[in-house]
């Protein structure tokens, strides 16, 4: 397959959401999605954010539905209109369309869609970076958290720093040249203290490109998803998840939007 | 260029007190723990104090408690080391270093140093 | 006194490799914590050459490497080089959120 489609690469699955990701694989609508659009979701005259046109993104998989994927929205169906949880004010909803109720088949995704961008392309205008995101309450199981930029040119690294007051329970940073060598490295600081690395060597970012990135937390891990494709998974070192209140956000990085909502 | 300079050193009798700063450049500064580290002339490094992006989590070796602080101020990307009632074994070429995730905590930029010199 | 406990000196030829030690306890080296080692040349700050017990950070040859054992952390140089002559550093975090150094170790290129 030279393209990619959500239904596509559910077919034959014999289960529409398997453990999908939201907006990521397989709640998106296969049909019905924001009138006028090009793709359901998609900015106008733009293939969706995650997918590189005239091929399949990185970890898709046409004809199946991809592992280790997030689990759906607990109720099917658009936000009616007030804004989401940790979306920006005075945007619509994700799923709704601006001056309307949330249409049917519309993104169902709580805000782990593009709520700072609205669905029709309406600027956010770029974050400053470094940005931190409150994460009032904390962070809990079936948490997400949706990140969306452009790697800078030339890019060394990108960093996100779950933050516990002076503590980092999730530090997440892939580098683009660690030894001539591209890397993504997973940490945890405590008491002053960083502690032993974690490291993945799949690198689904590219310098100059566009980024979505997707953190799920689970009841004992972060689960990462970068241009809808799984990435890594993260197990809790700090269990008190209520005091994982800020997310920071830097980096070689221009910053399209951040934003976090229960599924 | 990621870089640090330390300013501030000179001559100061014994009970004095002197203030030294260290300017950043080159990296966000509000992101990473600085520390202070020490070298007395021909001998070993000395870890002093760290302070975290925040100002909120602040740590000393126990031979400055009570008579050294640490604070930065992250609008002005600088980092400051208040010394009072200073000692002759306080001699020593200190250095702003930063520490950071990036580098599991390693202490990866150093400034060139600034000699403090306790004499009367 | 240092908490971290280095050898004085060391020497190799060129070519030749060596391992400077550094011994802590289950405080700091043992518990642990994360283990840096810095080079020094005389009148120079010094260079960050390992952190986290093992890893190397850009532009540090790979001729340096570091591993860690009980108490006890290594740096071993191989392939030793002129360039290489210079003071070794140890670093660890310890139990109480603080920072201590080795001694520190003279490298002497025979």
């Known amino acids: 397959a030279d393209s990619f489609s959500l239904n596509d690469a559910l077919a034959g699955s014999g289960n529409p959401n398997p453990q999908g990701y939201p907006g990521a694989w397989g709640n998106q609508p296969g049909a019905g999605g924001y009138p006028g659009a090009a793709y359901p979701g998609a900015y106008p005259g733009q293939a969706p954010p995650g997918a590189y046109p005239g091929q399949a993104p990185p970890g898709a998989y046409p004809g199946q539905a991809p592992p280790s994927a997030y689990p759906g929205p607990t109720a099917p169906g658009a936000y009616p209109g007030p804004t989401a949880p940790g979306a920006y004010p005075g945007q619509p909803a994700p799923g709704a369309f601006p001056g309307q109720p949330g249409a049917p088949g519309a993104y169902p995704q709580c805000s782990g869609g593009y709520p700072a961008a609205g669905p029709y392309g309406v600027p956010a205008g770029p974050l400053t970076v470094p940005y931190d995101l409150p994460l009032p309450g904390g962070v809990m199981p079936r948490m997400l958290i949706t990140i969306m930029g452009t790697v800078k040119p030339n890019a060394n690294r990108i960093v996100l720093d779950f933050r516990r007051g002076n503590d980092v329970a999730f530090h997440f940073n892939p580098r683009f040249n660690e030894n001539n060598r591209r890397v993504i490295v997973c940490n945890t600081k405590q008491d002053n203290n960083w502690g032993k690395e974690e490291r993945q060597s799949a690198f689904p970012f590219e310098s100059g490109k566009p980024f979505k990135i997707q953190v799920l937390v689970e009841a004992d891990h972060f689960k990462v998803a970068v241009n809808d494709a799984h990435l890594l998974q993260y197990n809790h070192r700090m269990k008190n998840l209520r005091e994982i209140s800020q997310l920071g956000i830097s980096g070689d990085i221009t910053l399209t939007s951040a934003n976090h909502a229960m599924i | 260029e990621v870089q640090l300079v330390e300013s501030g050193g000179s001559l100061v009798k014994p009970g004095g007190s002197l203030r030294l700063s260290c300017a950043a450049s080159?990296?966000?500064?509000?992101?990473?723990?600085m520390n202070w580290v020490r070298q007395a002339p021909g001998k070993g490094l000395e870890w002093i104090s760290s302070i975290d992006g925040s100002s909120r989590s602040i740590y000393y070796a126990d031979f400055v408690k009570g008579r050294f602080t640490i604070s930065r101020d992250n609008a002005k990307n600088s980092l400051y080391l208040q010394m009072n009632s200073l000692r002759a074994e306080d001699t020593a070429v200190y250095y702003c270093?930063?520490?950071?995730?990036?580098?599991?905590?390693?202490?990866?930029?150093w400034g060139r140093g600034t000699l403090v010199t306790v004499s009367s | 006194q240092s908490v971290l406990t280095q050898p004085a000196s060391v020497s190799g030829s060129p070519g030749q490799s060596i391992t400077i030690s550094c011994a802590g306890t289950?405080?700091?080296?043992?518990?642990?914590?994360?283990v840096a080692w810095y080079q020094q040349h005389p009148g120079k700050a010094p260079k960050l050459m390992i952190y986290s017990d093992s890893y190397r950070p850009s532009g540090v040859s790979n001729r340096f490497s570091g591993s860690k054992s009980g108490n006890t952390a290594s740096l071993t140089i191989s392939g030793l080089q002129a360039e290489d002559e210079a003071d070794y550093y140890c670093?660890?975090?310890?139990?109480?959120?603080?920072?201590?150094f080795g001694g520190g170790t003279k490298l002497e290129i025979k």
């Open positions: 270093v930063r520490s950071s995730g990036y580098s599991g905590g390693g202490m990866d930029v």
């Open positions: 670093s660890s975090y310890t139990s109480n959120s603080a920072r201590v």
């Open positions: 080159g990296f966000t500064f509000s992101n990473d723990d």
């Open positions: 289950s405080s700091d080296v043992g518990g642990s914590y994360n």
